[in-house]
């Protein structure tokens, strides 16, 4: 059976930073941030688009020693990310997978709201251990917060664009990207 | 632990404008939305509007728009609700309100009392 | 704006007796609500949230339930403390509305 929970959550961190930072760049901030819920996240095959596959180890002492992620639709428009648990974990005789999908929706005050949905693909008859749901969505908690507190005290970083000055561009001041950024300081 | 402490009372002449502050404490202040809330003598309770800490962005009622503004101190861990063109129906208790992440309220400060009157 | 129904407004019970408010809501708002306590003087304290959840350090004696449209706030068994005036809270996506309150007093 499928089995679906719901849930929404907020942060006073702006969708699109958020987004960059918790989503696209998770794997490496995770054990960054929270070193006691993942050890290390590493890519087995993919660029990180859809059909890249992660291993995500967690820390000694936490009930399951690894899970692996299968990318879905990342949509940087619309701020989406769609993934699917398909081994380690709770994934086993009862569970053939959890497809999550997040969307990072922008509120008028410059914050985010985050839409979550877990869909649990059970085996036959099985129903979803609901312990198992709970610490699925603590863990989540527990990453989302530590990405948020990282970014608040870390004002510059993950930011969409950059202000550059006159003098370093020659011109008017305007707004460019980290990339354009990057660019511009290496010519 | 969390703490919420708001300015004393304030009296007011209709028409007049009026700024009540709410000190945090025990959490970091820019992670959480704060809210005003407020109570006519005898009646329920009234939303307001917000704050996001972090950004300074505002999101009112819309009942207020126009007439309200929110602002914040993240140095001092302070937010403030200024209410202009006051009205004897602005008597009120003005509460600021910690969101949790959910959107409920998880922390509330003690009150501010504003009277108008002539 | 999501309009919230609170009934009874007043209600008079006795230390003992089991206590049911409820709140309606215009519109779903799926599980997002909370149920607070405030007496006089003093700001609501948060009982309640998520429709079913109860806060950390409040008695067991209360407990939630209903999603949707329909909501209960029911105390078991009333104590001496439990006088006060009782608000329902919808906070569905990115609005927030009161009901208008119960007043719990003395039969």
């Known amino acids: 059976g499928v089995f679906n929970y719901e849930t929404e959550t907020t942060s006073v961190i702006p969708a699109a930073r958020l987004f960059k930072a918790f989503i696209l760049d998770g794997d490496n901030l995770f054990p960054k941030v929270a070193p006691q819920a993942i050890s290390s996240v590493e890519n087995i095959e993919g660029n990180g688009g859809p059909g890249t596959i992660k291993k995500i180890s967690f820390p000694e002492g936490l009930p399951f020693k690894y899970v692996k992620d299968r990318v879905d639709e990342v949509d940087h428009t619309n701020f989406k990310y769609n993934y699917a648990v398909i081994e380690g974990g709770p994934i086993g005789d009862t569970l053939e997978k959890i497809s999550n999908e997040i969307k990072i929706v922008a509120t008028p005050d410059g914050g985010s709201i985050l839409k979550i949905s877990n869909k649990y693909h059970t085996k036959g008859d099985h129903e979803v251990k609901a312990e198992q749901v709970k610490a699925s969505k603590e863990m989540g908690e527990t990453l989302l917060r530590a990405v948020e507190s990282y970014l608040l005290a870390h004002s510059d970083a993950y930011n969409e664009q950059k202000l550059i000055s006159e003098e370093d561009l020659g011109g008017e001041q305007k707004l460019i990207s980290e990339e354009d950024l990057h660019h511009h300081h290496h010519h | 632990q969390v703490q919420l402490v708001q300015s004393g009372a304030e009296v007011r002449k209709p028409g007049a404008s009026v700024k009540v502050s709410c000190k945090a404490s025990?959490?970091?202040?820019?992670?959480?939305?704060l809210h005003w809330v407020r109570q006519a003598p005898g009646q329920g309770l009234e939303w307001m509007g917000l704050?996001?800490?972090?950004?300074?962005?505002?999101n009112f009622a819309q009942k207020f728009q126009g007439r309200v503004t929110m602002t914040r101190d993240s140095s001092i861990s302070a937010a403030y609700m200024e209410l202009s063109r006051l009205r004897s129906d602005d008597t009120a208790v003005y509460y600021c309100a910690r969101q949790h992440w959910n959107r409920y309220f998880d922390n509330w400060g003690q009150g501010t009392l504003v009277t108008v009157s002539s | 704006d999501i309009q919230m129904t609170q009934s009874p407004s007043t209600l008079s019970a006795s230390v003992g007796d089991r206590v049911t408010i409820t709140c309606r809501a215009s519109q779903s708002v799926g599980n997002w609500l909370a149920w607070y306590q405030q007496k006089p003087g003093k700001a609501p304290k948060l009982l309640i949230q998520?429709?079913?959840s109860i806060e950390s350090g409040v008695p067991s004696r209360f407990s939630g339930s209903g999603s949707g449209t329909e909501f209960t706030l029911i105390v078991s068994s009333l104590q001496p403390d439990d006088f006060a005036t009782y608000y329902c809270q919808q906070y569905n996506s990115y609005s927030w509305t009161f009901g208008h309150g119960t007043k719990v007093e003395i039969k």
């Open positions: 998520e429709a079913s």
């Open positions: 704050i996001n800490p972090n950004t300074g962005g505002t």
């Open positions: 025990g959490y970091t202040f820019t992670g959480y939305y």
